[in-house]
């Protein structure tokens, strides 16, 4: 089941998925002046079995005289089955690379890909939040968000993170990149009174990013 929305935005914070659940799709988008090769895949798909997961398909971009304006669509399950499998593994990966069962790593970059990567997340996907440089974290709970299915609808849990502008004495003390976990932390889901404001995307930009404009897609 695909998640309907993007993960929530937290002021002065950035999020990342450290691994992608099987079923996740990544659009094959190319930067301006390039387009997908004619026989190229529309998307990559995280697939696998109990012991190994990898990305099916490979995104490839080629130079184009005109800008590629083809709108990306979420592929249907029957389309997914027909696509050729090409394992995407980065060369020279260190041996200590963590591998989470049922999850794929970030796909390696491909030539002339678009700046933003558009993922179609599935239920159970987790993303992790960190305050950007110049801000420190005030935690009320987990600094993560999980896409959950509640009463037939998908929603992202609200990360319990506040980033305050107080400068730290040392840069990012004790911070560590979180290890991806296949299960979200338990939380009460007895109530179905979920309103859109619970996961409204906040558009306040981090102070260090104020000169740039980004889409709300995961980059």
């Amino acid at each position: 089941e695909l998640c309907d929305d993007d993960p929530p935005e937290i002021p002065h914070a950035t999020f990342k998925a450290m691994a992608y659940k099987e079923g996740t799709m990544l659009n094959c988008e190319c930067k301006r002046g390039f387009r997908r090769i004619k026989s190229g895949s529309l998307y990559m798909l995280c697939t696998g079995n109990s012991s190994h997961s990898s990305w099916d398909n490979q995104c490839q971009c080629t130079s184009s005289a005109t800008r590629n304006t083809t709108k990306q669509v979420t592929p249907q399950p029957e389309e997914q089955k027909e696509r050729k499998t090409t394992e995407m593994q980065s060369p020279m990966q260190p041996v200590d690379q963590a591998s989470l069962p049922g999850h794929c790593r970030e796909p390696p970059p491909w030539e002339n890909e678009a700046t933003e990567r558009i993922y179609h997340f599935v239920v159970g996907q987790m993303v992790y939040y960190q305050c950007v440089q110049g801000y420190r974290a005030l935690h009320r709970g987990p600094a993560e968000s999980v896409c959950k299915m509640t009463h037939g609808k998908t929603r992202w849990t609200q990360p319990q993170l506040i980033c305050t502008g107080e400068m730290e004495t040392s840069q990012f003390p004790g911070e560590e990149k979180p290890q991806a976990s296949p299960e979200g932390r338990p939380e009460s889901e007895t109530s179905c009174l979920v309103t859109t404001t619970d996961f409204q995307i906040q558009t306040e930009m981090a102070a260090t990013m104020e000169t740039s404009i980004f889409t709300t897609e995961y980059q």
Epitope: E9, F15, T115, T208, Q219
Partner: nanobody, 130 residues
Framework: QLQLVESGGGLVQAGGSLRLSCAAS????????IGWFRQASGKEREGVSY????????FYADSVKGRFIISSDNAKNTVDLQMNSLNPDDAAVYYC???????????????????????WGKGTLVTVSS
């Protein structure tokens, strides 16, 4: 598949300088943090420096602050590491690496960890003689 190619390594005397370069032809720089790790013989690979390809912000490990300078040329798809005042502790194989930026094009230093990079170069050897 896109590749990272390092150059500029070599033998230098203590106190000397070297300039490493990482060529990443075809890489969409403004979607990545691009930078350097190093691995000395018998030691773990450690993050040295990176530059955010979107906003140009930089990070340096404490051990190289004030001596190393990272820079990028997005038009040429290269990232350089100017290494000054080299000492024997800097001797290592230096690897170029890239890691996807987070949302809003931001990146934090705690993500610059060896197990989590998206792509690696093959490395270039830096030897510092005393």
């Amino acid at each position: 598949q896109l590749q990272l190619v390092e150059s500029g390594g070599g033998l230098v005397q203590a106190g000397g300088s070297l300039r490493l370069s990482c060529a990443a032809s075809g890489l969409t720089f403004d979607g990545y943090a691009i930078g350097w790790f190093r691995q000395a013989s018998g030691k773990e690979r450690e993050g040295v420096s990176y530059i955010n390809g979107r906003d140009g912000s930089t990070f340096y490990a404490d051990s190289v602050k004030g001596r190393f300078i990272i820079s990028s040329d997005n038009a040429k798809n290269t990232v350089d590491l100017q290494m000054n005042s080299l000492n024997p502790d800097d001797a290592a194989v230096y690897y170029c690496a890239v890691d996807r930026l987070g949302s809003r094009g931001a990146y934090v230093s705690s993500w610059w960890r060896s197990p989590d990079m998206d792509l690696w170069g093959k490395g270039t050897l830096v030897t510092v003689s005393s």
